[in-house]
């Protein structure tokens, strides 16, 4: 990723060519989350629907065990939306009581696990303070960007609090990736 | 979409091939909305600019009567942003009066209509409670994801309240799709 | 961009063909911003990391002096996220004092500069009123859409207040573009 590759400007046909319909692609949709133990100081990962309704995986892009598996090296567009919902945030309760008003927050992270690095790599993070005064609040966090991924890399979506994720509709909370 | 298609790993050239510049694509931008009757319990659809300024449709992707028409089957990336703006939300007024504080909300839905299927399909939803204390508030909701669409499918953007949509600038509220 | 181009429906192989891996692409990540003078009534532009960590430019897409340079004409998907963070917004202080409560706001604009055109073009804008009651607030604004760009066009990201941009992590604030 360090430098810049200059393709000869006169060359219009490149190799190998491949049909776009054969590229690895996946769109995963939310399901009800089963509470699981997760490591302290590590956000829990969501699990997903991969074949019912709007969800699909194709062309060797596989979903298993909360991970999307990258089947070939290349540049991928990776995206997710998580819709959160909750009751009045603690921060407003604390504020009313005159205590320090550090806000609650909601966070989504798209994480890459790779064989060559012992730490997961955070590709994308959306984080938002929540200081809602109303008793019921809800809001989405959307993320999307392009990354150079390697065959065998694994992608997952982690959230700050799995109990706040809106799992009621497949169009509200989702996760996808496709080879460009 | 149910299973996984395994492409032979030795095969580098796939068919049919096609130049990327010939794929159906559209980027539509906001225009002032004319108030229209819409069915109760059904969010109204926005209409769009399709050829002036930043807006365009190309390669058989057509816009007509609030709908983007999908001209060929395949996987599409579909996106929209709607910027909303309003005065103090009811929820804060209600709260001040000591009445139940169910929050106001703003919602965007990208909907697919298929002639062969009686019910529209909600592809994407962004929904947010609005409990702003300031007298004037404004905020965007962004959506984007990949879907397998069929020739003849129609896409539209629905919103919870058409009167709150910021139609003043083409860069604030938009809708697009492109074949991958 | 005005009309619609109809490709012959019987023709499956188009020209010129090119391998997707050879297309111009960039993903830039946030760095600490150096305070710079900017014109009154003009939002300052961010500068970016283009080769370390997750950041890269490839296939003649170059980054220089806050700009992404478009090396060939075509349809590009352009995206950015900016995470903002700050202390209690003025609007809540003003509100408490009973003065007019015009809200603070945070804004991101992706701007195109074309040498042959005197005025920059705003491609995308995300703008949000900030009326947070908590003492510390943070939130992202995400933008992404497709545009027809010309060889030589330059893209930049402008923000309403550079001092509010969270530059601490490459996954929180980023900017990218790729030829479709």
């Amino acid at each position: 990723l360090k430098g810049q590759e200059f393709a000869p400007s006169h060359q219009q046909v490149y190799a190998p060519l491949r049909a776009d319909g054969d590229k690895p692609r996946a769109h995963l949709t939310v399901v009800r989350q089963t509470p699981t133990q997760h490591l302290k100081n590590q956000f829990p990962a969501l699990h997903w629907e991969h074949e019912l309704g709007l969800a699909f995986t194709k062309n060797r892009m596989n979903y298993t065990n909360k991970f999307l598996l990258i089947p070939e090296s290349g540049d991928y567009f990776v995206y997710s939306q998580v819709t959160f919902r909750g009751m009045t945030s603690e921060c407003s309760e604390i504020r009313q009581a005159g205590r320090p008003n550090k806000p609650d927050s909601i966070t989504v992270v798209i994480t890459k696990v790779t064989d060559s690095y012992p730490e997961p790599t955070q590709l994308l993070m959306g984080t938002k303070s929540v200081c809602e005064v109303g008793s019921n609040w809800f809001q989405p966090i959307y993320l999307g960007a392009m990354f150079s991924l390697q065959e065998g890399d694994k992608l997952m979506v982690n959230v700050s609090d799995i109990s706040l994720v809106d799992y009621t509709k497949e169009d509200k909370t989702f996760f996808g990736a496709f080879l460009l | 979409l149910k299973g996984q298609e395994f492409a032979p790993s030795h095969q580098q050239v796939y068919a049919p091939l096609r130049a990327d510049g010939d794929k159906p694509r559209a980027h539509l931008t906001v225009v002032r909305q004319t108030p229209t009757q819409h069915l109760k319990n059904q969010f109204p659809a926005l209409h769009w600019e399709h050829e002036l300024g930043l807006a365009f449709t190309k390669n058989r992707m057509n816009y007509t009567n609030k709908f983007l028409l999908i001209p060929e089957s395949g996987d599409y990336f579909v996106y929209s942003q709607v910027t909303f703006r309003g005065m103090t939300s009811e929820c804060s007024e209600i709260r001040q009066a000591g009445r139940p504080n169910k929050p106001d909300s703003i919602t965007v839905v990208i909907t697919k209509v298929t002639d062969s299927y009686p019910e529209p399909t909600q592809l994407l939803m962004g929904t947010k409670s609005v409990c702003e204390v300031g007298s004037n508030w404004f905020q965007p909701i962004y959506l984007g994801a990949m879907f397998s669409l069929q020739e003849g499918d129609k896409l539209m953007v629905n919103v919870s309240d058409i009167s709150l949509v910021d139609y003043t600038k083409e860069d604030k509220t938009f809708f697009g799709a492109f074949l991958l | 961009l005005k009309g619609q181009e109809f490709a012959p429906s019987h023709q499956q192989v188009y020209a010129p063909l090119r391998a997707d891996g050879d297309k111009p692409r960039a993903h830039l990540t946030v760095v600490r911003q150096t305070p710079t003078q900017h014109l009154k009534n003009q939002f300052p532009a961010l500068h970016w990391e283009h080769e370390l960590g997750l950041a890269f430019t490839k296939n003649r897409m170059n980054y220089t002096n806050k700009f992404l340079l478009i090396p060939e004409s075509g349809d590009y998907f352009v995206y950015s996220q900016v995470t903002f963070r700050g202390m209690t917004s003025e609007c809540s202080e003003i509100r408490q004092a009973g003065r007019p409560n015009k809200p603070d706001s945070i804004t991101v604009v992706i701007t195109k500069v074309t040498d042959s055109y005197p005025e920059p073009t705003q491609l995308l804008m995300g703008t949000k009123s900030v009326c947070e009651v908590g003492s510390n607030w943070f939130q992202p604004i995400y933008l992404g859409a497709m545009f027809s760009l010309q060889e030589g066009d330059k893209l930049m990201v402008n923000v309403s207040d550079i001092s509010l941009v969270d530059y601490t992590k490459e996954d929180k604030t980023f900017f990218g573009a790729f030829l479709l």
Epitope: K2, T64, P71, D115, P118, E119 | - | -
Partner: antibody, heavy 116, light 106 residues
Framework: QVQLQESGPGLVRPSQTLSLTCTVS????????MHWVRQRPGRGLEWMGR????????KYNPSLKSRVTITRDTSKNQVSLRLSSVTAADTAVYYC?????????WGQGSLVTVSS | DIQMTQSPSSLSASVGDRVTITCRAS?????MYWYQQKPGKAPKLLIY???NLASGVPSRFSGSGSGTDFTFTISSLQPEDIATYYC?????????FGQGTKVEIK
């Protein structure tokens, strides 16, 4: 706790196939990557290859690629190494290693001698 | 292959001494890893990503460098640090190790 245990015959005849199994416990193998690394007597460490257990994707050291195969059986929490056409130069301690998203963990190693 | 050249191949130092080992890659790598191997034992990860201390590793161990030149340091040598130390790059295929540096107490 996390454990990796290599097992297999300590003696293999020249030209035969060396087979080792690594049985893991204390973690979900599908969330990681499993490697084989060997250390020949008095020599340094040599990476042989790895498998991504969830999808089965493999990468091999090109110098061994024609002879090495790594497979996994997730139902048994096992990863296997096969090295064909062995010679005395393949005498080594063979280590099973976990990586990816978690601290590296190495097995205690399995000494394999190639001799007739 | 990316060749890893480690130096010195062996060194002898006193308890409390600062010990430095270098590793040079034949081409630039983003991340470097350092392992400790005691006789008859499996290697143990000490440093990852050139400079990050692995969990449970004493703070007297550190790493630095980028590109092709990397350094591993023991700020104050302890008797239990007697071992062979290896650098490794994980980026190119194959992953390659340095030839090792044997550290002894004077």
């Amino acid at each position: 706790q996390v454990q990796l245990q290599e097992s297999g015959p300590g003696l293999v005849r020249p030209s035969q196939t060396l087979s080792l199994t690594c049985t893991v416990s204390g973690f979900d193998m599908q969330s990681t990557y499993m490697h084989w690394v060997r250390q020949r007597p008095g020599r340094g460490l040599e990476w042989m290859g790895r498998i991504e257990p969830a999808g089965g994707h493999t990468k091999y050291n090109p110098s061994l690629k024609s002879r090495v195969t790594i497979t996994r059986d997730t139902s048994k929490n096992q990863v296997s190494l096969r090295l064909s056409s062995v010679t005395a130069a393949d005498t080594a301690v063979y280590y099973c290693v976990r990586s990816g998203g978690l601290p590296d963990v190495w097995g205690q190693g399995s000494l394999v001698t190639v001799s007739s | 292959d990316i060749q890893m050249t480690q130096s010195p191949s062996s060194l002898s130092a006193s308890v409390g001494d600062r010990v430095t080992i270098t590793c040079r890659a034949s081409q630039g790598v983003e991340y470097m890893y350092w392992y400790q191997q005691k006789p008859g034992k499996a290697p143990k990860l000490l440093i990852y990503g050139a400079s990050n201390l692995a969990s449970g590793v004493p703070s007297r161990f550190s790493g630095s460098g980028s590109g092709t030149d990397f350094t591993f340091t023991i700020s104050s040598l302890q008797p239990e640090d007697i071992a062979t130390y290896y650098c490794q790059q994980w980026e190119g295929n194959p992953r390659t190790f340095g030839q090792g540096t044997k550290v002894e107490i004077k």
